[in-house]
Interface confidence: low
């Protein structure tokens, strides 16, 4: 995943926490929160694996890259990063692995330069629809986010709300059309069974979409047509059985696309013929020579590119009277 990188050197350790009722005075330029390491030269603050239960209030105004990984934040409330003056330089925020289970509306408000956000490896049982838009207006002010990393944010089964996890995530992505400028979206390892049909059409700036290691069975109702800037589409390690003509044509029509399809349980029967023909002709699929059949049993491990139409048959459906158990 694309975490904020840092060439941090000369980290300084910190003074004790300020009281939570923050003074109106701006923080001292060399101040560093307790349990954090700071490098003004690298514009980086690292509060990593310190079991913090809330975001430090006294973050230095210069911070551009903030790592709050490996903590125990649990809840990210509205205005969690709101400061006076705002943390106007903060561009990359990594909150991965911090045991967040709830991200509330407006959690990232007052971060006018936030371009990269990583919430991976948090069991997000409750992601507010307005977590990223910060407003419940039908059209919000545009978010500055360019990269949103949401790998492995699915909570354990027993902690999920009584609603579709896919729907909850998509609602946050689409609220207020705030993420129109998003270029990278990573949603790997989230047990997604389907992709709601409207999600991609409303993220027209996407260059990179990672849906690997989910449980997607079909892309029949997903349209890639509007994603004219899409450069990489990761669909490895899903449950895809076949890609149908409409999807193939849409992918072929994207001018810069590279598609990754490894480790899907391809079903090599008569419905696979169009996809095999397409694979033989297309340049967009990376590692296409590695794609192999999983079903039916007689076709297991056959390389898709080596199949011909005679190999791809469907067993005739017998009338009920002739079927055997």
């Amino acid at each position: 995943s694309s975490s904020p990188t840092s060439s941090a050197s000369s980290f300084s350790s910190s003074a004790p926490f300020l009281a939570s009722a923050v003074s109106a005075q701006p923080p001292l330029p060399d101040q560093c929160p307790a349990l954090c390491e700071c490098s003004e030269a690298a514009r980086t603050v690292k509060c990593v694996n310190r079991n913090l239960t809330e975001v430090p209030t006294d973050l230095p105004a210069y911070v551009r890259n903030l790592f709050l990984t490996g903590n125990q934040l649990a809840v990210l409330p509205a205005g969690a990063f709101a400061r006076r003056p705002p943390l106007a330089e903060l561009a990359a925020l990594n909150l991965s692995g911090s045991r967040l289970d709830e991200v509330r509306a407006g959690a990232f408000e007052h971060l006018p330069s936030l371009r990269q956000l990583d919430l991976s490896h948090n069991p997000l049982a409750d992601l507010s629809p307005f977590a990223f838009s910060g407003s419940n207006a039908s059209v919000s002010a545009p978010s500055p986010l360019v990269e949103l990393i949401l790998n492995h944010i699915v909570p354990p089964e027993d902690e999920r709300q009584n609603r579709s996890f896919e729907g909850m995530v998509v609602a946050a992505l689409l609220a207020g059309r705030a993420l129109q400028g998003l270029r990278r979206l990573e949603l790997a390892s989230n047990h997604f069974l389907y992709l709601p049909r409207d999600v991609l059409a409303q993220l027209p700036s996407l260059r990179h979409l990672d849906l690997s290691n989910n449980s997607l069975v079909s892309l029949t109702y997903v349209s890639f047509r509007n994603l004219t800037h899409l450069e990489s589409l990761h669909l490895e390690d899903n449950a895809l059985k076949v890609l149908h003509n409409g999807t193939l044509a849409e992918l072929q029509g994207l001018p810069h696309i590279r598609v990754f399809l490894d480790n899907n349980p391809w079903v090599c029967d008569c419905h696979m013929a169009d996809m095999v023909t397409w694979l033989k002709e297309t340049e967009v699929v990376q590692g296409k020579d590695r794609l192999t059949c999983a079903y039916p049993e007689k076709m297991r491990n056959r390389v898709l590119l080596e199949l011909n139409s005679a190999d791809l048959d469907c067993d005739p459906i017998l009338p009920p009277s002739l079927q055997t158990s």
Partner: antibody
Framework: EVQLVESGGGLVQPGGSLRLSCAAS????????ISWVRQAPGKGLEWVAE????????YYNEKFKGRFTISRDNAKNSLYLQMNSLRAEDTAVYYC??????????WGQGTLVTVSS | DIQMTQSPSSLSASVGDRVTITCTAS???????LHWYQQKPGKAPKLLIY???NLASGVPSRFSGSGSGTDFTLTISSLQPEDFATYYC?????????FGGGTKVEIK
């Protein structure tokens, strides 16, 4: 429908205290910053303090720090302003206002505080 | 503190006039955090324009905002009877949050 309703205003003598309340409804209280703003008769708007109901962040106008205390009760969806050592110049209409990146989008109707002997 | 200075402090205009109100900040304000409000006598202020140039919900398109840094402008392209009110600019950037002194728009 979002509603903010202030109460607790009235006549108080100089040096006295008053506690204003703001009852919020129609939205998730812990999702928005909320402020107190006051307006003296015939004058402009003056920001007093703000609080992020979902966290512990509080900001004061230094002018009021020490005399005024902002607080909230999330269970009651309520915001408070405790005002001590009141002076004649604190006479004003006090508004609570819901905020966010996009300004104060909802205001209460205001409650009048009169400090006079 | 960031001082917000509005000019003029009052103006008289007729229905249909184009009206411009300026707001000057004593130091630079991030344009995301510069807002305008309208207030009528005896009423609470109402958000008019947020983040320098975005119309708040339900605000007519004759209102517009512009500016950056320290200089911001509110324009009413064609004044209507219901627009006679006091207008305030507001910086939501640096504590203490501050408002301009107000511009009262009166009927000529």
């Amino acid at each position: 429908e979002v509603q903010l309703v202030e109460s607790g205003g009235g006549l108080v003598q100089p040096g006295g205290s008053l506690r204003l309340s703001c009852a919020a409804s129609g939205y998730t209280f812990t999702d928005y910053v909320i402020s107190w703003v006051r307006q003296a008769p015939g004058k402009g708007l003056e920001w007093v303090a703000e609080i992020y109901p979902g966290s512990n962040s509080i900001y004061y106008n230094e002018k009021f720090k020490g005399r005024f205390t902002i607080s909230r009760d999330n269970a009651k969806n309520s915001l408070y302003l405790q005002m001590n050592s009141l002076r004649a110049e604190d006479t004003a209409v006090y508004y609570c206002a819901r905020g966010g990146n996009y300004g104060f989008d909802y205001w209460g109707q205001g409650t009048l505080v009169t400090v006079s002997s | 503190d960031i001082q917000m200075t509005q000019s003029p402090s009052s103006l008289s205009a007729s229905v249909g006039d184009r009206v411009t109100i300026t707001c000057t900040a004593s130091s630079s304000v991030n344009s995301n955090y510069l807002h305008w409000y309208q207030q009528k006598p005896g009423k609470a202020p109402k958000l008019l324009i947020y983040s320098t140039s975005n119309l708040a919900s339900g605000v007519p398109s004759r209102f517009s905002g512009s500016g950056s840094g320290t200089d911001f402008t509110l324009t009413i392209s064609s004044l209507q009877p219901e627009d006679f009110a006091t207008y305030y600019c507001h910086q939501y950037h640096r504590s203490p949050l501050t408002f301009g002194g107000g511009t009262k728009v009166e009927i000529k």
